[in-house]
Amino acid sequence: EHPTADRAGCSASGACYSLHHATMKRQAAEEACILRGGALSTVRAGAELRAVLALLRAGPGPGGGSKDLLFWVALQLPPGCGDPKRLPLRGFSWLSSDPGGLESDTLQWVEEPQRSCTARRCAVLQATGGVEPAGWKEMRCHLRANGYLCKYQFEVLCPAPRPGAASNLSYRAPFQLHSAALDFSPPGTEVSALCRGQLPISVTCIADEIGARWDKLSGDVLCPCPGRYLRAGKCAELPNCLDDLGGFACECATGFELGKDGRSCVTS
């Protein structure tokens, strides 16, 4: 449905971000984000900046990372003479009024924006090779960038379910995006996978009075393990449960508990 949906990520705070490769004018990009249930993304500072950088660095878009790419963000200079000396955004401001981190913690300008007192001016995030953020760059609002960044805000998120014996995991987020993995998922996200014997399973993140949880999921493991051990959320055998220092690196599967020896699982 949305072929331009490339990557998404959510943080525990309830903020999710998606990055899209699509040649669009600013207005069309802003509308695309609204249609997905979000808004053109702010990239203020701190956690927000880190989340967006992680999306960019997850891999190049079309062209294989050979050229610089420009992504629309919610940064603009309203009509009227902004103060170009106002650091660090040179008079530009974020569209949404929600408080962010310190704006001194933002990216640099790739080149100094021009002064203009007449037209509304926009800005893009320039990414070197499509993956390494170089900084902000002024761009006329009616020109086309290579893509755009959307932001979504949710009150609660589901932590990623542990696969257990599941394979072929696929996430479908409510902002119309398919992904192979999300650390946190907003309500409405559907996770599908295959259990042993190629049995399909599908769970959905739902929100209730308590918080967010995966429906139809007993515990937090998608597919039960045939054995007793899980390592990093996946089924494991006892020999694979020792870390480099000989410590026990596994946890016990549902129905088992850690034995007295501290390194084996016994029936609970």
Epitope: E1, P3, Q27, A28, A32, I34, R144
Partner: antibody, heavy 117, light 108 residues
Framework: EVQLQQSGTVLARPGASVKMSCKAS????????MHWVKQRPGQGLEWIGA????????SYNQKFKGKAKLTAVTSTSTAYMELSSLTNEDSAVFYC????????????WGQGTSVTV | QIVLTQSPAIMSASLGERVTMTCTAS???????LHWYQQKPGSSPKLWIY???NLASGVPARFSGSGSGTSYSLTISSMEAEDAATYYC?????????FGGGTKLEIK
């Protein structure tokens, strides 16, 4: 001058499908989202969905998923909406519309296609 | 989805009278994304006021719009015969974009 020219009145049987068109002129078809809106006789307006002809991105109102399918042909600057499994509830005037000069207000509308089931 | 409730559903006004109709949103809407349309029988809707208070091209200055958050209104300072129509408020702050049920304005 921006114009959206829609196909003519349709009379259809229950259970059938219809496909209506919206030919755009006077602007760059691939640069703007095209929206579709439903209006039942004597009633208000309902947003069905939108398509971005530049890359065929679509977004639907949940209510119309499975009922409406939006497509676009860039070579002819024409957007299409197909309605399937028609019932009496689908008898309405359907408008294609898009924003152009004003932020997110749908400021150009076709003349409407009337569908009677 | 955001539900827009318009009131009154039907109203009549004398020529020269001041007219105000309201649009209440079920949750807060940015004023940039609240618009009004005018529709007359047999015609397509026309953008009338955009971003709460900006008059669309060709709209007479007797029309004005105001509001913020969940409460918006359209006012005609002095009713004229050509103003008889149905007016719809419309939001595009959240998808799906939604319309109010309309206020039908008649001449008394």
């Amino acid at each position: 001058e921006v114009q959206l020219q829609q196909s003519g009145t349709v009379l259809a049987r229950p259970g059938a499908s219809v496909k209506m068109s919206c030919k755009a002129s006077g602007y760059t078809f691939t640069s703007y989202w095209m929206h579709w809106v439903k209006q039942r006789p004597g009633q208000g307006l309902e947003w069905i969905g939108a398509i971005y002809p530049g890359n065929s991105d679509t977004s639907y109102n949940q209510k119309f998923k499975g009922k409406a399918k939006l497509t676009a042909v860039t070579s002819t600057s024409t957007a299409y909406m197909e309605l399937s499994s028609l019932t009496n509830e689908d008898s309405a005037v359907f408008y294609c519309t898009h924003y152009y000069g004003s932020d997110y207000a749908m400021d150009y509308w076709g003349q409407g296609t009337s569908v009677t089931v | 989805q955001i539900v827009l409730t318009q009131s009154p559903a039907i109203m009549s006004a004398s020529l020269g009278e001041r007219v105000t109709m309201t649009c209440t949103a079920s949750s807060s809407v940015s004023s940039s994304y609240l618009h009004w349309y005018q529709q007359k029988p047999g015609s397509s809707p026309k953008l009338w006021i955009y971003s709460t208070s900006n008059l669309a091209s060709g709209v007479p200055a007797r029309f004005s719009g105001s509001g913020s958050g969940t409460s918006y209104s359209l006012t005609i300072s002095s009713m004229e015969a050509e103003d008889a129509a149905t007016y719809y408020c419309h939001q595009y702050h959240r998808s799906p974009r939604t319309f109010g049920g309309g206020t039908k304005l008649e001449i008394k």
